[in-house]
């Protein structure tokens, strides 16, 4: 009995034409939604003039359907038992699952001003930039619609910059009609214990963003894992959103629509400072903002974002050190709402439910050459938005799963 099940599973989780895994892998049958909460700044003038704490008020959810497009350019390589593909990006607004429309306005940090002052630290360049910021009537903060903030707008200040810079700015610009990858993953034909594990990303085994082992591309993309998952395992996966590999550990047994699954969570240790967790030393890339690598809970991914000072954290700075959030008022971190988890069916290794939560922040520093940043007396890691990307196996699929997998085991 058990041997037969194992044999069937091993056959069906291989990523090749004709298997159950392959069909669902090419185009997920699960509806995936990405909810956004935008941090609306309540006191822009006080911050700019007096270097006050930034008072934010989250507004959301604004919901989009995502990852509904099938993988593209799927190519099997029998020589090394891999399959390569592109994951196309697409987002469709879901008004019925949102608190407002894409035309809703928000007061947010001026992305271009904050980024330009960081990318061009030369004092004379900053004098030049200052004249263009003033000429374009730009300020430290700006009012933008949801659509502009997420998917892009033409920035008036950047439109005047004589350097060859893109004048379009947006937290996820460009997104629609783009693709993530190329990913090359093991198809599991030679060894089922390697199925879905990433061999290369964009043609490389490393990211070139981090030093040492932090730069490695580890594990799968978290949509599935090799079968026969044990509770004692540390599940490694790579997330291009955060420009790094990370891991999840077992937390609890969960019953999902009659299917027994293991809930794996991203532990606080993964976000710890090198002082608390020496393994994280290579994720600390600079000494000043990180207070000599003692700060925790934020990840500087500027190297992955063309030098723009983007910092990734958990929503509301969950698991972050007090110094990170001391300049921001209005945050309420909550483990239940703001942590990331994966519900994995252990026999197949399939992720049947997940909630990926992350926050995108931008660093803004005082600049004595840029008028609108001149009065700042400290650095701010400014929360722009947080997102909750969720997917749950549909009722029909769950029924099929119960009958074909868990039912047979039990």
């Amino acid at each position: 009995g058990d041997m037969l099940i194992q044999k069937t599973i091993k056959k069906e989780v291989v990523l090749e034409e004709g298997t159950i895994a392959f069909k669902n892998w090419v185009k997920t049958g699960t509806e995936i939604y990405r909810q956004f909460w935008i941090f609306d700044v309540q006191n822009p003038q006080e911050v700019m003039m007096n270097s006050s704490n930034i008072q934010v008020k989250q507004r959301g959810p604004y919901t989009y359907r995502v990852r509904f497009l099938a993988k593209e350019n799927i190519t099997q390589d029998p020589k090394d038992n891999t399959v390569s593909f592109l994951q196309p990006n697409g987002a469709i607004f879901e008004p019925s699952l949102s608190v407002g429309t894409e035309a809703d306005n928000f007061t947010v940090l001026n992305l271009a001003v904050a980024a330009a002052s960081h990318i061009y630290p030369n004092p004379f360049v900053q004098v030049v930039l200052n004249s263009l910021i003033n000429k374009s009537k730009s300020s430290m903060f700006q009012v933008r619609t949801l659509r502009e903030l997420l998917w892009g707008y033409t920035d008036p200040f950047l439109s005047l910059v004589p350097y060859p810079v893109s004048t379009r700015v947006g937290m996820f610009y460009p997104y629609n009609n783009t693709a993530d990858g190329v990913y090359k993953v093991f198809n599991g034909k030679d060894s089922i214990s390697k199925v879905a594990i990433i061999d290369t990303y964009k043609g490389k085994r490393n990211l070139s963003y981090w030093e040492s082992y932090c730069d490695m591309i580890n594990g799968t993309d978290a949509a599935s894992f090799p079968p026969f998952v044990e509770k004692s395992q540390v599940l490694q996966f790579f997330s291009s959103d955060i420009c790094r590999s990370i891991y999840a550990v077992f937390e609890s047994d969960v019953n999902l629509k009659g299917i027994p699954v293991y809930r794996f969570v991203l532990p606080s240790k993964a976000f710890a400072s090198p002082v608390q967790n020496p393994d994280n030393h290579c994720f600390c890339t600079e000494k000043i903002i990180s207070k000599n690598c003692t700060s925790y809970g934020v990840l500087d991914i500027s190297k992955c974002k063309e030098g723009k000072p983007v910092y990734i954290s958990l929503p509301h700075f969950l698991y972050a050190s007090p110094d990170v959030s001391e300049t921001i008022d209005g945050l309420n971190p909550n483990e239940e709402e703001h942590r990331t988890y994966l519900d994995i069916e252990p026999i197949t290794g399939f992720t049947l439910q997940f909630a990926k939560r992350l926050q995108v922040n931008l660093l803004v520093k005082p600049s004595n050459k840029i008028q609108v940043l001149k009065r700042l007396k400290r650095n701010y890691i400014v929360p722009i938005l947080w997102l909750n990307e969720t997917g749950t196996i549909g009722d029909e699929k769950a029924k099929m799963f119960r009958s074909q997998v868990t039912g047979k085991i039990n």
């Epitope: 030369n122 004092p123 004379f124 360049v125 004098v127 030049v128 200052n130 004249s131 003033n134 004589p162 350097y163 004595n368 050459k369 001149k374």
Partner: antibody
Framework: QVQLQQSGAELVMPGASVKMSCKAS????????MHWVKQRPGQGLEWIGA????????SYNQKFKGKATLTVDESSSTAYMQLSSLTSEDSAVYYC??????????????WGQGTLVTVSA | ETTVTQSPASLSMAIGEKVTIRCITS??????MNWYQQKPGEPPKLLIS???TLRPGVPSRFSSSGYGTDFVFTIDNMLSEDVADYYC?????????FGSGTKLEIK
């Protein structure tokens, strides 16, 4: 030590052009912008403009746009300024200057010795 | 463009006296004012940079103060070697602009 060596004095006809040089030594040339400053005899100083020596991006004082053209030659660590359609108003000493970036910025911390341009028929 | 008005145009002072030169700007430039000394036949020399910062190697008898639009440059005990032209420069915005200069002579 930082040195900016400028080319020698020029006597030029009205309507003609002149190109002067400023050779830098004692530092990495492409790490700093090069500024140019005009001083008419017995008069004050005027900022003409500056050039980013690493990518040749220029920033001009509007007053000198069309009059001055700034260029660089990275291989010889030399900055150039060409002045065109010369008139008697262009008779002056022209300086190249470089900043110093430390804990605070020192604008025009290093100067060349100046190039005297005399416009006369 | 920020206009810089420097006064006086010339100044005749006795050795050991206190010298005061003033620059007023047409716009608020915070503390982005610089002061230069120029002796005949030489390029200008930076004495004081933004934020009233005395440059290394410059004697402490030279100082400056001011913020916003009103700036003062001071020589506490004038020496004969201080005979020169003095210029202020605003570096807050482009184009950088100089004051018209002050000629300091010995009385």
């Amino acid at each position: 030590q930082v040195q900016l060596q400028q080319s020698g004095a020029e006597l030029v006809m009205p309507g003609a052009s002149v190109k002067m040089s400023c050779k830098a030594s004692g530092y990495t040339f492409t790490d700093y912008w090069m500024h140019w400053v005009k001083q008419r005899p017995g008069q004050g100083l005027e900022w003409i403009g500056a050039i980013d020596t690493s990518d040749s991006y220029t920033s001009y004082n509007q007053k000198f746009k069309g009059k001055a053209t700034l260029t660089v030659d990275e291989s010889s660590s030399t900055a150039y300024m060409q002045l065109s359609s010369l008139t008697s108003e262009d008779s002056a000493v022209y300086y190249c200057a470089r900043d110093y970036y430390g804990s605070s910025t020192a604008w025009f911390a290093y100067w060349g010795q100046g190039t005297l341009v005399t416009v006369s028929a | 463009e920020t206009t810089v008005t420097q006064s006086p145009a010339s100044l005749s002072m006795a050795i050991g006296e206190k010298v005061t030169i003033r620059c007023i700007t047409s716009t608020d430039i915070d503390d982005d004012m610089n002061w230069y000394q120029q002796k005949p036949g030489e390029p200008p020399k930076l004495l004081i940079s933004e934020g009233n910062t005395l440059r290394p190697g410059v004697p402490s008898r030279f100082s400056s103060s001011g913020y916003g639009t009103d700036f003062v440059f001071t020589i506490d005990n004038m020496l004969s070697e201080d005979v020169a032209d003095y210029y202020c420069l605003q570096s807050d915005n482009l184009p950088f602009t100089f004051g018209s200069g002050t000629k300091l002579e010995i009385k």
